[in-house]
Each structure stands twice: as structure tokens, then as C-alpha cells.
């Protein structure tokens, strides 16, 4: 129809960026990470939402790889793990470099869209991953992680979690600990995107608080239209205008529709809600393909970008505001987020009390001189 | 170095109005979130309003909704606090605050100590 065909001609020119997808965990569960396995070849991979061809239909332009570990692995070989998952997607981009662009700024971003290829780019999904740690953290950092999701589905000892707000798990941080902020300043030297998915209010408005610069909540949707905690509510909204962050929204049918089923059009209802409250610079697309188990009819898959595009058009969004949920929104924010990294200025270096510092089996060395 | 220099204060009925300024000298404003904070006797500062980098966002404390605005003129590397329907419990030293930030809106809640430069403070007093 009409409003596809147009979808098609502006995708053309400005592809999707998502900001979350979970293949390098189907990768590490089907495979054990073993690329080269003929099962695992990315053209013709079968049972997951993502593979290549299903990317080129979709007008994957760009893609935040989730590099996650489990919360079970706190305190234990979380960043072991971490580094596990940020090769698997290195050797990914390098096993099909006619596909993928692995990227590490918003210029890397617009040449993967001139080459026509996945500009690929890394996001760590979950605070545990960095073990407490801000050497850790800069470390992450000299290997690719451009967004680190404060937590995943449990407290750090320095950020609290979403479960908090459902009364599953106990507020430790309220918000933020003191080094959660030093964490958070660091994000900011760095040019590292801070992203709020996953976190408890409190977590989301210390962090939109503090930050100099615009956030990202990578795959998040409006708590307004489905009432689940791992949505983002009116009065965050309202930060999220100020500050000029941005939403990408969840396809999760649980997010969605607050029920084992969900449809496309229910999406477009989220995105024309942060739209509303927050402005139509603050909407994006997160759809966490690969890391759910239920999606909406109409987006089974990586394939159907075009056809939630075609969904707000016919909605009378504008292109401009299409656009900028597909790509220029996220490229405005990412670009904010490198003019405010300063590498020039003295890292943070308190590290975090060893009283508050998880696990049993620790060395502490350093803490005792 | 940003110097801010607060002015416009002084002595009001109740009811009365007041228009604070905040001004920059030799430096420019442009990339900074600006707030209002004020200090009464025996209390604790407490932010009244702040303004976005263009001065097109702005918010304001619930104790001064639609009796107070916020705007800033950075041709003049100005701001300004326009107080109207002042009451005694409005009486307080007013300071403006200024923070580099790199959006175009300012977060009311930000703590007073991630603001990277202070005014010296402007007297207002309400009389009843």
C-alpha cells in the first residue's frame, strides 16, 4: 500500500537504528559463541527474530548489540562473561564484513549507511558487568562499550534496579550510591551513553539529575499505555524532554500490552505516547529482538521495521518526525553524548568502599594502606 | 571562569512584584542551565526555577507555579526572575547558579553542588 511504499523510500535513506537486540546471547546459548559452527552461519540461522536477510528487509541501518551476562553472574565471572560477549560480536562484524560495520561513534554510524552496511556497535546490558569497578568500566570502554545499561534485573551495590518498584527486590541505593554517581560522571568523561532501561524511578531521575548529557532508556516503552514497571513513567517523560533523551521503545508483548499478546498497532500506541509527553525527539525503536520471548503480531521479526514505519505514517507523523525516531534522534543524542566526553579531565578514581563491594570470594588489596 | 552577578532585590509589599537579573560578565552563558536558588533566615537554599540553554524549557518549584517566570536574554548573557504576587514567606537571599550541561533543558531536581558557578546573592525581603 501506500504508506509501505513510503516507509520503503524513507528507509531507503535513513535506516533503522535499534537500540537493543539480544543476538550475541542466542549466539553464546545455541552455539557456546562458536561462529564458525554451520548451524550458526547468519545468512541462513534459523529460529531467532535476527539473521542477515532479515536485517536487509527490515532496513537495519544500525544496531546496538546487547552485550549481556545473567545476574547470577555478579560477584562471580560477570566480567569474564562481559568479555566473552564483546568478542563474539567483534568476530561477528569480522566474519561478515560485506554486513556488519562494528563502530564506535556517531561518524561510524553515518559511514556504515554509506557503505550500506549494520553499523554495529556495542552495548553492555547491565552495571554487574563492571564488577564495581571504574578501571573496569574504562576498560569496557577501549573495547567498544558505547552504552552500559546501569542494571539489568538486580541491584548493583551502587544502582538500583526495576524490581525494586514492583517490591521484588529492596531499594539499596535510592537511586544512586555515591560511586553509582561517580559511574555516572565517568559515562560522561567518556562519551559513553548512559542507558536507564532495566532501572527503578528513583535510579532514572538521580541519573537524569546528574548527567550533563542526554540519556537513552535503549529498550523501554510508556508506562502510561501498559503499567508495567520496566516502563518509563509521565514524569520521567517529562526529564526526558529536558534533557533531550531518548526512548526506544520495547516490543516485548508484556510491555506492550501488559499481556501474552500484543500487536503492532499497540507499539505505534507507545511511540505516539512519548511522542505526546516527551516530544517526537525523544522516540526511537529498542526492540529487544533475540532477547524475548514474545513479540507483537505484525513484528515477528527484524524484517517488519517497515511496516511499524508504515503504521505511523498512517498515523499522520510527519517524515521528519519518522526520520528521527528511525535515526536522527539517536544520532542527535549520541552526538551530544561525544561533545560532552572530555578524555582531558581527570578520571574518576575513588573506588567503591569495600564495605559496599558484593561477594565472598574477593581479595582486597589496595583497601588496607 | 563565569562570574554571575545577581541584581533587582529589594524591599516589596505583599503582593508586590520584583524582576531579578542574573548577568554575566565577560563570559558567555550560552551553554549553560541557569537556576534560581534562595535561602530564607534559619533555612536550608532551595531552588526556585531554572531555564534551558535557549530559554525556550523551563520549570519551576511548586511553591512558585504561576507566580514566578523564568527567562533569559543571551544577547545580554542575562537572566531574569520575574516575581509577581510576592508573599512574606518569599523572603529570602536569591542566588542564580549556572551549569555546563549539553541539552537544551534544565532538570529542577539537579543538587546544588553539580552547578559550576554561583552568584554572590540578591536581598529580597516581603513585608506584610
Known amino acids: 500500500d501506500f504508506f509501505r511504499d513510503e516507509a520503503e523510500r524513507i528507509m531507503r535513506d535513513s535506516p533503522v537504528i535499534d537500540g537493543h537486540n539480544d543476538l550475541p546471547w542466542q549466539l553464546l546459548d545455541m552455539f557456546n559463541n562458536r561462529l564458525q559452527d554451520e548451524r550458526a552461519n547468519l545468512t541462513t540461522l534459523a529460529g531467532t527474530h535476527t539473521n542477515i536477510p532479515k536485517l536487509r528487509a527490515g532496513f537495519v541501518g544500525g544496531q546496538f548489540w546487547s552485550v549481556y551476562t545473567p545476574c547470577d553472574t555478579q560477584n562471580k565471572d560477570a566480567v569474564r562473561r562481559t568479555l566473552e560477549q564483546m568478542d563474539v560480536v567483534h568476530r561477528m562484524c569480522r566474519m561478515y564484513p560485506e554486513t556488519f560495520l562494528y563502530v564506535t561513534s556517531s561518524a561510524g554510524i553515518r559511514q556504515a549507511f554509506r557503505e550500506g552496511k549494520v553499523a554495529s556497535l556495542i552495548g553492555v546490558e547491565g552495571g554487574h558487568s563492571i564488577d564495581s569497578s571504574l578501571g573496569v568500566l574504562r576498560a569496557l570502554y577501549q573495547l567498544g562499550m558505547r552504552y552500559l545499561t546501569l542494571t539489568h534485573s538486580c541491584n548493583t551495590p551502587w544502582a538500583d534496579n526495576w524490581l525494586v518498584d514492583t517490591g521484588d527486590s529492596e531499594p539499596q541505593s535510592q537511586g544512586l550510591s555515591p560511586f553509582g554517581q561517580r559511574v555516572v560522571k565517568e559515562l560522561n568523561r567518556l562519551g559513553v551513553l548512559i542507558d536507564l532501561a532495566h532501572v527503578s524511578v528513583a535510579t532514572m531521575k538521580a541519573t537524569l539529575q546528574l548527567s550533563r548529557a542526554p540519556v537513552i532508556f535503549s529498550h523501554s516503552s510508556a508506562y502510561s499505555v501498559c503499567a508495567s514497571r520496566r516502563n518509563v513513567p509521565d514524569d520521567v517523560l517529562r526529564l526526558v524532554k529536558q534533557t533531550d533523551s531518548l526512548v526506544m521503545v520495547n516490543f516485548y508483548n508484556n510491555y506492550i500490552s501488559c499481556t501474552n499478546k500484543a500487536n503492532l498497532s499497540q507499539v505505534a500506541d507507545h511511540l505516539d505516547h512519548i511522542k505526546e509527553v516527551a516530544g517526537a525527539r525523544a522516540v526511537g525503536f529498542g526492540g529487544d529482538f533475540d532477547g524475548v520471548p514474545r513479540v507483537p503480531e505484525g513484528l515477528e521479526d527484524v524484517s517488519k521495521y517497515p511496516d511499524l514505519i508504515a503504521e505511523l505514517l498512517r498515523r499522520n507523523w510527519t517524515e521528519a518526525e519518522v526520520k528521527g525516531a528511525l535515526a536522527d534522534n539517536l544520532l542527535r543524542v549520541f552526538e551530544a553524548v561525544e561533545q560532552a566526553s572530555n578524555l582531558t579531565q581527570a578520571p574518576e578514581e575513588e573506588p567503591i568502599p569495600l564495605d559496599q563491594l558484593g561477594g565472598s570470594c574477593r581479595t582486597h588489596y589496595g583497601y588496607s594502606s | 571562569e563565569v562570574q554571575l552577578v545577581e541584581s533587582g532585590g529589594g524591599l516589596v509589599e505583599y503582593g508586590g512584584s520584583l524582576r531579578l537579573s542574573c548577568a554575566a560578565s565577560?563570559?558567555?552563558?550560552?551553554?549553560?542551565?541557569i537556576a534560581w536558588f534562595r535561602q530564607a533566615p534559619g533555612k536550608e537554599r532551595e531552588v526556585v526555577s531554572c531555564?534551558?540553554?535557549?530559554?525556550?524549557?523551563?520549570d519551576y518549584a511548586d511553591s512558585v507555579k504561576g507566580r514566578f517566570t523564568i527567562s533569559r536574554d543571551n544577547a545580554k548573557n542575562t537572566v531574569y526572575l520575574q516575581m509577581n504576587s510576592l508573599k512574606p514567606e518569599d523572603t529570602a537571599v536569591y542566588s542564580c547558579?549556572?551549569?555546563?550541561?549539553?541539552?537544551?533543558?534544565?532538570?529542577?531536581?539537579?543538587?546544588?553542588?553539580?552547578?559550576?558557578?554561583w552568584g554572590q546573592g540578591t536581598q529580597v525581603t516581603v513585608s506584610s
Open positions: 531555564v534551558g540553554k535557549s530559554g525556550g524549557r523551563s
Open positions: 565577560e563570559s558567555t552563558l550560552d551553554n549553560y542551565a
Open positions: 547558579a549556572a551549569r555546563r550541561v549539553w541539552f537544551g533543558g534544565c532538570v529542577l531536581g539537579t543538587s546544588q553542588g553539580q552547578y559550576d558557578y
